[in-house]
Interface confidence: medium
């Protein structure tokens, strides 16, 4: 899956791990994909170092990334979305190490967005709902997503729901009365794309009602 | 040395099936997209299916859907078509082809001998 | 689906010839366009990808250019072993699809 530099050749650079990592967005910005890149070790010095993809593209061979501090990055109509590419660190004309991805499994979707609570006295639950930008693409319509909430004093436990939909019931017996709670969400693609899951969406804060004391239940 | 070797061909009834394989050496199978392209005596190429390499994109000319099927097995670098409800048209020299999408787009660059099918009662 | 019209059918020509074959795509299909060469009874042979990038080991008299919907292939000086047919090939990768062209027989005159 990947090569290095034959001996002789770049010597300083084989003693570097040149290690990456990449993930994809399809439709990110219109219909342009985009495709980010970035090493693994945080301490590489990336000075003369280029990425390179090739293979799988439309119209053309090859395609240069551009470096925005320390992640590699492309935003192109051309990915075929078919078969895979070859991925490259380069020194140069010289390839120091190279991987061949198919760009359909590494697709990270984008965060969710919107995010709600509403508390529905009557039927005492609470209605999360929140929204997507995929639900219009072309490609990566279908996510699973993974709402996540906690109260606010209980810093890492967090309880996961995961759900096709955009909505989700909480039902307020479940939770704390009188409490803050903190709820956020992310998507992974899941049907035909495969790949990372998105980041979360900024944080919703809600408050459940107190225990009314006549009736046992929250007010 | 790169290389498709096609069998399975041979003389059926109409209505009746029949397996088509193709055996991949000298290359990188699972990197590849394969095809299967057909012939009939005297006419030109028809393109007849086609598989991604890891089988989730797949495509069928009008004339064979819903009646053949493509499939592969990349442990074994081996191509298949499941051929079924046969008929007389589709008596044709079927080749297995290679795809080579690094050229930019679906190229075929890497075709076997083929194998004949006859459909005849 | 996109349809592939080569013209001429067929036509003869005489060795050191200069032959142009045409192949129309029915919509615009920017350079996603190959030409194969086939001799009887053997299988077809890659000869040019993108419309015009020659493939390796394919003799330099081989041209091919071309975008969008009108694409031509061109043999500069025609040899004894380039008279067979030859076929234009497009793609969609959105469902998975191919098509060739009905293809061109090139006979000696």
């Known amino acids: 899956e990947s090569g290095y530099a034959q001996n002789g050749d770049l010597e300083d650079a084989e003693l570097d791990d040149y290690s990456f990592s990449c993930y994809s967005q399809l439709e990110v910005n219109g219909s342009q994909h985009s495709l980010t890149c970035a090493f693994e070790d945080p301490d590489v010095n990336t000075t003369n170092l280029e990425f390179e993809i090739c293979g799988a593209l439309v119209e053309v061979k090859c395609l240069n990334f551009r470096k925005l501090q320390e992640i590699y990055f492309i935003e192109t109509k051309k990915f075929l979305l078919i078969g895979k590419s070859n991925i490259c660190v380069k020194v140069g004309e010289k390839s120091l190490t190279c991987k061949k991805i198919d760009l359909t499994t590494i697709v990270k979707p984008e965060a969710p967005f919107d995010l709600s609570v509403i508390y529905r006295e009557g039927a005492n639950d609470f209605v999360v709902t929140f929204n997507t930008s995929h639900l219009q693409k072309k490609y990566v319509k279908v996510l699973m997503h993974d709402v996540a909430y906690r109260q606010e004093k209980d810093e890492n436990k967090w309880t996961h729901v995961n759900l096709s939909s955009t909505k989700l019931t909480l039902l307020q017996r479940k939770l704390q009365p009188a409490a803050m709670y903190e709820i956020k969400v992310r998507s992974i693609p899941d049907h035909y794309f495969k790949g990372f899951w998105s980041e979360w969406s900024p944080s919703y804060y809600f408050r459940t009602p107190e225990i009314n004391n006549s009736s046992g239940e929250m007010d | 040395e790169v290389q498709l070797v096609e069998s399975g061909g041979g003389l059926v009834q109409p209505g009746r099936s029949l397996r088509l394989s193709c055996a991949a050496s000298g290359f990188t199978f699972d990197d590849h997209a394969m095809h299967w392209v057909r012939q009939a005596p005297g006419k030109g190429l028809e393109w007849v299916s086609g598989i991604s390499w890891n089988s989730r994109g797949i495509g069928y000319a009008d004339s064979v859907k819903g009646r053949f099927t493509i499939f592969r097995d990349n442990a074994k670098n081996s191509l298949y078509l499941q051929m079924n409800s046969l008929r007389a048209e589709d008596t044709a020299l079927y080749y297995c082809a290679k795809d080579e999408y690094s050229r930019g787009y679906y190229v075929l660059d890497v075709w076997g001998q083929g194998t004949t099918v006859t459909v005849s009662s | 689906a996109i349809q592939l019209t080569q013209s001429p059918s067929s036509l003869s020509a005489s060795v050191g010839d200069r032959v142009t074959i045409t192949c129309a795509a029915s919509q615009g299909i920017s350079s996603a366009l190959a030409w194969y060469q086939q001799k009887p009874g053997k299988a077809p042979k890659l000869l040019i990808y993108?419309?015009?990038s020659l493939e390796s080991g394919v003799p330099s008299r081989f041209s091919g250019s071309g975008s969008g919907t009108d694409f031509t292939l061109t043999i500069s000086s025609l040899q004894p072993e380039d008279f067979a047919t030859y076929y234009c090939?497009?793609?969609?990768?959105?469902?998975?699809?191919?098509?060739f062209g009905q293809g061109t027989r090139l006979e000696i005159k």
């Open positions: 090939q497009q793609f969609n990768s959105y469902p998975l699809w191919i098509t």
């Open positions: 993108d419309a015009s």
